[in-house]
C-alpha cells in the first residue's frame, strides 16, 4: 500500500500521458485521480507502466469501485489485467466478447491462468451457454480450453457450437468428455455426406458407442491407428473381425503392431482364432 | 531469431550531430517499443528512451530531453536515434534493445551496438 | 532517480569457486531487479529478472536473490567463460537505472 501524501506542487495530472511513467507510486498516488484515470482508460494500455506503477492504478480503480468494474474500464485495462485476483474479477459483469477478447490478448502465449480461469467462467456463465463465437474466441487462444471443462459444463455446449473445434482442442479429453460431446457432434455434422462427415466426426469418435462403429465400418472410412486406439474399448469389444477390417481397410495392418495395447489387446481376445487368422497378420486369440 | 543489427562506427565534432540506425528482423517491428541505451568506455550503462514504432510516441529520459530524437521507418523495419550538440561526454557505445513485456522493462534483446566518438 | 550501487568493482575468483555480486538500491524496488553478463566486445546478455527468476537458456550455476533494496548475483561454480562485467537493473520506475558494473575474473 502507497501512503498517502500531498502531491508536489505543478505535479497533478490533467491527463493520462506518458509524463506519468516517470512518477514514482507515490507521486501516482498523490497527483493521479481516479476518476481521471477511470475516464481514461484506453490511454493506460499506451504507456508502459511497469509492473509496480501498475499497482498504484490499481489500487486507484479498486477504491474507485469497490463492488466491481465497470465494463467500459474492464475493456481498456490490457497490462493491468495481469494485476487482477480472480477475487477482483468475480466482482465483474463481462458481456462483450471484445472485452473478452481484449483481455486474453494480454495473456496470450502463457498458460491459463487462475485469472483467465476466472474470467472465461465468468463470461460463459453470463451468457447461459458455450456458444459458437465464444468458442472460437477461448480456441484460438488456449486449444486445449474444451478438454479442461468438466462433463456437466461441456453439456452447456450447443451442438452448433461443434463447428468451431478443431481436432488439436480435443487432444487431451478423456472419454468422460468425448461421451458428452461426440452426440452433439453427430448432430451437428448429420447432414453431411459420408467421407465429409468422417473427416469432421473423426477425433470425436472416442466417445462413439459400438452401433455407430458398426455403421462407420459400412462406409469404407479407412480409419487411422491413431483414431482406432482411442476408440472406448467397450465400444470396440462386439465388434467381429469383419467389421474391424472394413473399418481400418489398409490400417487393418497396424493391428500387428499394437496387439499389447488397449483396446485391441482386449478385442483379440474376444475374437475366435479362426476369425483373427483371416486377417493374416498372426494375431493370437 | 530476433536481431537488431546497428549501423557503423561514427567520429563526430563537438557540436554535430549523430543518427544510429537500427534494422529488426525476426519479430513484428511494431509491436516492441524500441529502447536506447548508451555506455561510455569503462562506464554502465545508461538508458535515454524509447520509441513505439506502431503509434510513433516517445519517452525520453530528461537528462536527453530537447537533444535526442528517436523516429522510426516501418517500411524497412528500422529504427533511428538522432543526438544532437555533441559534446565529448557523449562519447559511448549507443545499443537499441527491445523489451518484450512493457510491464517488465527488461532488455530481452539487445543491438549488437555503435561506437560513436566525439573528438575535436 | 533510483542509484544502483553495485560491489566490489572488480572481483578474482578461482575456476570452481563462488563468485558473489551485490546491489544496492537507493529506493525499495520490490523485487524488479534484472542482472545483464557482458563479455568483452559483445552487448549486454540478460541473465536473471524478479531478482531471482532464470532467462531461458542460462546455466543454473547463476542465482539471483533479494528483495527491497539489497540484491545478490551468486555463480555456484565458476567456469571460465563466466569471465565478463555484470550488470544489475532496476524495473521498479522509470528512468530505468543500471549498476556500474562488476569485473569478473579468474585468480
Known amino acids: 500500500e502507497v501512503e498517502k501524501t500531498a502531491c508536489p506542487s505543478g505535479k497533478k495530472a490533467r491527463e493520462i500521458d506518458e509524463s506519468l511513467i516517470f512518477y514514482k507510486k507515490w507521486e501516482l498516488e498523490a497527483c493521479v485521480d481516479a476518476a481521471l484515470l477511470a475516464t481514461q482508460m484506453d490511454r493506460v494500455n499506451a504507456i508502459p507502466f511497469t509492473y509496480e506503477q501498475l499497482d498504484v492504478l490499481k489500487h486507484k480503480l479498486d477504491e474507485l469501485y469497490p463492488q466491481g468494474y465497470p465494463e467500459s474500464v474492464i475493456q481498456h485495462l490490457g497490462y493491468l489485467f495481469l494485476k487482477m485476483s480472480p477475487e477482483d474479477i468475480r466482482k465483474w459483469n463481462v458481456t462483450s466478447l471484445e472485452t473478452l477478447k481484449a483481455l486474453l490478448e494480454v495473456n496470450k502465449g502463457h498458460e491459463m491462468s487462475p485469472q483467465v480461469a476466472t474470467l472465461i467462467d465468468r463470461f460463459v456463465k453470463g451468457r447461459g451457454q458455450l456458444d459458437k463465437d465464444t468458442l472460437d474466441t477461448l480456441t484460438a487462444f488456449y486449444p486445449g480450453y474444451l478438454c479442461s471443462l468438466s462433463p456437466e459444463e461441456l453439456s452447456s455446449v450447443p451442438p452448433s457450437s461443434i463447428w468451431a473445434v478443431r481436432p488439436q482442442d480435443l487432444d487431451t479429453c478423456d472419454p468422460r468428455q468425448l461421451d458428452v460431446l461426440y452426440p452433439k457432434a453427430r448432430l451437428a455434422f448429420q447432414n453431411m455426406n459420408g467421407s465429409e462427415y468422417f473427416v469432421k466426426i473423426q477425433s470425436f469418435l472416442g466417445g462413439a458407442p459400438t452401433e455407430d462403429l458398426k455403421a462407420l465400418s459400412q462406409q469404407n472410412v479407412s480409419m487411422d491407428l491413431a483414431t482406432f486406439m482411442k476408440l472406448r474399448t467397450d465400444a470396440v469389444l462386439p465388434l467381429t473381425v469383419a467389421e474391424v477390417q472394413k473399418l481400418l481397410g489398409p490400417h487393418v495392418e497396424g493391428l500387428k503392431a499394437e496387439e499389447r495395447h488397449r483396446p485391441v489387446r482386449d478385442w483379440i481376445l474376444r475374437q475366435r482364432q479362426d476369425d483373427l487368422d483371416t486377417l493374416g497378420l498372426g494375431l493370437q486369440g | 531469431q530476433v536481431q537488431l543489427v546497428q549501423s557503423g562506427a561514427e567520429v563526430k565534432k563537438p557540436g554535430a550531430s549523430v543518427k544510429v540506425s537500427c534494422k529488426a528482423s525476426?519479430?513484428?517491428?511494431?509491436?516492441?517499443?524500441m529502447h536506447w541505451v548508451r555506455q561510455a568506455p569503462g562506464q554502465g550503462l545508461e538508458w535515454m528512451g524509447m520509441?513505439?514504432?506502431?503509434?510513433?510516441?516517445?519517452i525520453y529520459y530528461e537528462k536527453f530531453q530537447g537533444r535526442v530524437t528517436m523516429t522510426v521507418d516501418k517500411s524497412i523495419s528500422t529504427a533511428y536515434m538522432e543526438l544532437s550538440r555533441l559534446r565529448s561526454d557523449d562519447t559511448a557505445v549507443y545499443y537499441c534493445?527491445?523489451?518484450?513485456?512493457?510491464?517488465?522493462?527488461?532488455?530481452?534483446?539487445w543491438g549488437q551496438g555503435t561506437l560513436v566518438t566525439v573528438s575535436s | 532517480d533510483i542509484v544502483m550501487t553495485q560491489s566490489p568493482d572488480s572481483l578474482a575468483v578461482s575456476l570452481g569457486e563462488r563468485a558473489t555480486i551485490n546491489c544496492k538500491a537507493s529506493?525499495?524496488?520490490?523485487?524488479?531487479v534484472a542482472w545483464y553478463q557482458q563479455k568483452p566486445g559483445q552487448s549486454p546478455k540478460l541473465l536473471i529478472y524478479w531478482a531471482s527468476t532464470r532467462h531461458s537458456g542460462v546455466p543454473d550455476r547463476f542465482t539471483g536473490s533479494g528483495s527491497g533494496t539489497d540484491f545478490t548475483l551468486t555463480i555456484s561454480s565458476l567456469q571460465a567463460e563466466d569471465v565478463a562485467v555484470y550488470f544489475c537493473?532496476?524495473?521498479?520506475?522509470?528512468?530505468?537505472?543500471f549498476g556500474a558494473g562488476t569485473k569478473l575474473e579468474i585468480k
Open positions: 534493445a527491445i523489451i518484450i513485456t512493457p510491464v517488465v522493462p527488461k532488455f530481452d534483446y
Open positions: 525476426g519479430y513484428t517491428f511494431t509491436s516492441y517499443w
Open positions: 537493473q532496476q524495473y521498479s520506475s522509470y528512468p530505468l537505472t
Open positions: 520509441i513505439h514504432p506502431n503509434s510513433d510516441n516517445t
Open positions: 529506493h525499495d524496488v520490490g523485487t524488479s
